[in-house]
Structures are given as C-alpha cells and as structure tokens.
C-alpha cells in the first residue's frame, strides 16, 4: 500500500539568464528510494539512481547541476525552459510516486516563488 | 530472481554495425525502474553508454549520442542497444543491467565487441 506523499516546489518562476532549484521530498513512508527520474515533457533530464548515482542528459549537462540531494539546479534559464517537470521516485516496497512542477521562465524582474504543495 | 544476458557481441570493422540484445528472465520485465548500457575496455574503467526508463525515456553518454540507440521490447523481456558507426575505441566488453523497484542492481554477464581497423 502506498501511503506516501510528494512534496515539490509547486508552481514557480523565474528570471531569464537565472537559476532555479527542482524539488521534490517523499515524505509519510519508509520506503527505499532505487531511482529518482527528472523528465520535462518528453525528455529525460538526469536519473540519480542508489547504485549507479547521477546521469545527466548531455543536451542539458550544461545548465543542469544534481542536487541538492535527490533535486535538480537548472542553470542559464531561457523562456524554453517553462513547462511542466516531473520527479518520478521508484521505491521499495511501495512502487512509483511521481511529482509535478510548472517552472515559468519570465522576461522581467518579477519572478516570484509560489506556494509549495503535495501531491498524494 | 532476475538475470540477464548480453548478446550479440563480435568482431566487425570500423564503419560497421552491430545489435547488442540483453535478455531478462525471472521477473516481470515491464516493472524495470530503468535498463543500462555500460561497457568497460582492458585497463580502463566501467563507461556509462544509454539508459532506458520504464517510460521509454532515453538519456546517452556523449561519446555514443547520435550513433547507438538503445530500445526495449518488453513483450520480448529484451532491452537493445543499436550501435551503428563503431570505432576501434568502441572496443570494450558491453554489459547491461537492470534496476527495479527493489534495492540493488542486476548485471549481465557481458558481451565482447571488437572492432579492427
């Protein structure tokens, strides 16, 4: 039974040309993380996997940094970047938790943070 | 328990192709969290190659993006890694393995690729 939850960084923007933090923490389980998966639409950003650690795309290498911990650090940001991202945690004994970001990139200064959230 | 096994491997010349297949048994393919491509070459450390998650998601090592394709047939238990253009420092022994949704990985045996110039 998955009793777990995914808490992310929700919905966020940020400036062109700056850097932004992808979060997610599974929390209210005591299941073992295998595999973390970063995807952005149809791509596959960077897997941390336990054994294997970090692999990260190279169209991405660039502007995309592991961590902190099980999270993401995209760098050089351009209006291309907005869109949805998802954290999919494989786990052991519960199975596959997934969580969503929508990451804004805006032109202008007034990038603001928004509200974290869960996803059951 | 999973195992897994490399074929396909061989001699070929530069220029040339060549399918690596690896073959799971044991457990339901389709509940993999990710298949791997590594291969390691005399004297030289495990390279990182492809990755194919249990979306179909694919992620490539600089050194083989644009020339191997790694695919998965899961009604075949099989992952493939495609490699097409191979040079003599393509030659290594290829191993896959298999991370599922339990702790700890699954490795193949390996498969020797030699490429002649």
């Known amino acids: 039974m998955m009793t777990g939850t995914i808490e992310t960084t929700g919905n966020i923007s940020a400036e062109k040309g700056g850097s932004i933090i992808l979060q997610c923490h599974l929390s209210s389980t005591t299941a073992q993380v295998t595999q973390v998966n970063w995807e952005q639409q149809d791509q596959l950003l960077a897997i941390c996997n336990a054994d294997l650690g970090w692999h990260i795309s190279p169209s991405f290498k660039d502007r995309v940094a592991p961590g902190p911990g099980l999270g993401l650090t995209l760098q050089s940001l351009t209006v291309n970047d907005t869109g949805e991202y998802f954290c999919i945690y494989h786990t052991y004994p519960d199975g596959t938790y997934t969580g969503r970001i929508f990451l804004e990139v805006l032109e202008s200064s007034v990038a603001e943070h928004g509200a974290r959230f869960q996803i059951p | 328990e999973v195992q897994l096994v490399e074929s396909g491997g061989g001699l070929v010349q530069a220029g040339g192709s060549l399918r690596l297949s690896c073959a799971a048994s044991?457990?339901?393919?389709?509940?993999?969290?990710s298949m791997w491509w590594f291969r390691q070459a005399p004297g030289k450390e495990r390279e990182f190659l492809a990755?194919?998650?249990?979306?179909?998601?694919?992620l490539y090592a600089d050194s083989v993006k644009g020339r191997f394709t790694i695919s998965a047939d899961n009604a075949k238990n099989t992952v493939y890694l495609q490699m097409n253009s191979l040079k003599p420092e393509d030659t290594a022994v290829y191993y896959c393995?298999?991370?599922?949704?339990?702790?700890?990985?699954?490795w193949g045996q390996g498969t020797q690729v030699t490429v002649s110039s």
């Open positions: 044991g457990r339901t393919f389709s509940t993999y969290a």
């Open positions: 393995a298999g991370s599922w949704s339990y702790p700890g990985l699954t």
């Open positions: 990755i194919i998650t249990d979306g179909s998601k694919t």
